[in-house]
């Protein structure tokens, strides 16, 4: 059975063997085409969601559609529904948290009053002056909170207890890719990760771990990427793996934040990099235990440069290593969080693409993920 | 330096099939997409469609889904365009044109596609 | 599919003018906006990508500028040269689509 499973695909009706290479071919095999159903399926960037939340401590930003124009959520009359409306609209099914905070000196947005309509936040036609003199702050979920804080040295081995929500992706048993836990269904993960296979059966994700083959895997059910830009085939590195079950939170699983849509990153940030990727360019094998290292935010301007991408560095992505080089993510370690520490952890960037491992001139190239919240959160809507 | 290189001028039939190459040079071929654009006579352009030289993958415009293919020999460093069901409409000058950060930095000479009875 | 409007569609200028070309996109497209110039007879040849990234080559008398749905070709001071038809073309997304065309002529 083991063998049948490994080289060939049951159809039904009538029952009959096909060859899995024949999976996700885009040839119709079986009789009813399930030979083509579990696929990487690509899901379009879709409309804009119309609600949001900042960086100023998590404050809720509302579109009125027939302008265009942003606001900020006033505190008056809001309610846990409203809440559980915004949060809804933005694809997340857990219970929010919500509190006041005061308007401060540099808020640029007005400041309206919010009401529901037909499942959707909208403004109150007579809002008037914002009275409670605060603001929204949501949280949708629980996030980016670790049991320990790691030491900012140059490469370590990292313990789970400081990233529980990273995990292994595997086909067929092997390490592919590294991902992110973002709610309990969802991980986060690369699109280029799934080129080589397209058939949803055989990936499989492993979570709560430092060692690669210690822990139990979990089936996905949906393996969802961006549309192909063939202007630009490095952008939309970025694929939302659906598991077939909800994960269990605990010390070692858990999620990390995405970004707020206003996250921008100045040069020389530090930021985190975690994976089991190659610890030498050509260097032969993965690491059994998972890696940590501190890098930095490098200039796009200096990343596109003639001496390093030559423009090829786009605005949905970002650079991050040490001036020096030395110190990068590598082969294995594609689809992994590239964090962000404030309040909480958040997956500012997507492992991606990049000439080489620790080049000085050519750092590790991320997919910027505050660039695909919009798509996030349409594909998250989609499957509620 | 870099050179894309088409095939000459074609007259055709209405309903017969046209492939034009594009030889690449001066560059590494598996480097860069290749995209088609063709422009009717006194019109604007339109793009039909890419390929990959690495893999071979290739995407098309939804106008010429089922009428196109583009093809690839590695060894040659050449990509083909066939359009086949040709009609009048179709009489154009088609363009392979290379990809490098979102714009089509080197364009070959043309070449030119009447269709006609 | 993303529609591209150029305007004007024809222009008449003279050698040492300002000229300006504007494109506007149906929905916003960011910064992923290429011009390109075509002389008769001749392939287009690219002049600005990403709305302002001056192509190697080009003369610094073009610039780019806009974001979201509206864009602006300049010609600082036109050269004999510089006389043919503009295109602009979006890169957001497949099918990649042109602008009509906007053809600058001599007065």
């Known amino acids: 059975k083991v063998i049948l499973d490994k080289y060939y695909f049951l159809c039904g009706q009538p029952l009959h063997f096909i060859p899995r290479k024949q999976l996700c071919d885009g040839e119709l095999d079986c009789p009813l085409g399930e030979d083509e159903e579990h696929c990487v399926k690509s899901f379009p960037e879709g409309p804009a969601v119309a609600v949001r939340l900042s960086k100023d401590r998590s404050t809720l930003q509302v579109l009125d559609s027939a302008t265009g124009n942003w606001f900020s959520a006033c505190f008056d009359n809001f309610t846990e529904a409203l809440a559980e409306t915004a949060c809804r609209q933005m694809g997340y099914s857990s219970k929010p948290t919500f509190r006041a905070v005061e308007i401060g000196p540099d808020q640029d947005l007005d400041v309206v009053e919010i009401t529901e309509n037909s499942q959707e936040l909208r403004m109150r036609n007579s809002s008037g002056p914002c009275l409670s003199g605060s603001l929204v702050s949501l949280h949708c979920l629980a996030c980016g909170k670790s049991l320990k804080t790691p030491r900012v040295v140059g490469v370590e081995e990292a313990s789970v207890d400081s990233w529980p929500w990273q995990v292994s992706i595997q086909y067929d048993k092997q390490h592919v890719c590294g991902g992110s836990i973002l709610d309990p269904h969802w991980v986060l993960t690369a699109a280029h990760c799934f080129r080589k296979h397209t058939d949803v059966f055989n990936w499989k994700v492993r979570a709560g771990s430092d060692k690669l083959g210690s822990f139990p895997s979990l089936a996905v059910a949906k393996i969802i990427i961006i549309e192909f830009n063939p202007m630009y085939p490095k952008d939309n590195d970025i694929a939302l793996m659906k598991l077939q079950f909800p994960l269990t939170f605990s010390g070692t699983v858990r999620p990390i934040c995405l970004p707020f849509f206003d996250e921008e990153l100045t040069p020389a940030t530090p930021l985190w990099i975690i994976g089991w990727g190659f610890t030498k360019q050509n260097g032969g094998k993965m690491s059994d235990i998972l890696l940590q290292a501190s890098v930095q935010v490098i200039d796009s301007t200096r990343c596109n440069a003639d001496d390093a991408y030559q423009g090829e560095v786009t605005e949905k992505m970002m650079c991050a290593g040490i001036p020096e080089g030395g110190v990068d993510t590598c082969q294995g370690d594609s689809g992994g969080p590239l964090m962000y520490q404030s309040d909480q952890w958040h997956v500012v960037g997507i492992v991606s693409w990049g000439y080489g491992c620790g080049g000085p001139s050519t750092p590790g190239v991320y997919t910027k993920v505050s660039a695909y919240l919009n798509w996030i959160y349409n594909v998250w809507k989609a499957e509620l | 330096q870099v050179q894309l290189v088409q095939s000459g001028a074609e007259v055709k039939k209405p309903g017969a099939s046209v492939k034009v190459s594009c030889k690449a040079s001066g560059y590494s071929f598996s480097g860069y997409y290749l995209h088609w654009v063709r422009q009717a006579p006194g019109q604007g352009l339109e793009w039909m469609g890419w390929?990959?030289?690495?893999?071979?993958?290739?995407g098309y415009a939804q106008n010429f889904q089922g009428r196109v293919t583009m093809t690839r020999d590695t060894s040659t460093s050449t990509v083909y365009m066939e359009l086949s069901s040709l009609r009048s409409e179709d009489t154009a000058v088609y363009y392979c044109?290379?990809?490098?950060?979102?714009?089509?930095?080197?364009w070959g000479q043309g070449t030119l596609v009447t269709v006609s009875s | 599919d993303i529609q591209m409007t150029q305007s004007p569609s024809s222009l008449s200028a003279s050698v040492g003018d300002r000229v300006t070309i504007t494109c506007r996109a149906s929905?916003?497209?960011?910064?992923?906006l290429n011009w390109y110039q075509q002389k008769p007879g001749k392939a287009p040849k690219l002049l600005i990508y990403a709305a302002s990234t001056l192509q190697s080559g080009v003369p610094s008398r073009f610039s780019g500028s806009g974001s979201g749905t509206d864009f602006t070709l300049t010609i600082s001071s036109l050269q004999p040269e510089d006389f043919a038809t503009y295109y602009c073309?979006?890169?957001?997304?497949?099918?990649?689509?042109f602008g009509q065309g906007t053809r600058l002529e001599i007065k």
């Open positions: 044109a290379r990809l490098h950060r979102g714009g089509h930095d080197y």
């Open positions: 073309q979006q890169s957001y997304s497949t099918p990649v689509t």
């Open positions: 929905q916003s497209i960011s910064r992923y």
């Open positions: 390929m990959n030289p690495d893999s071979g993958n290739t």
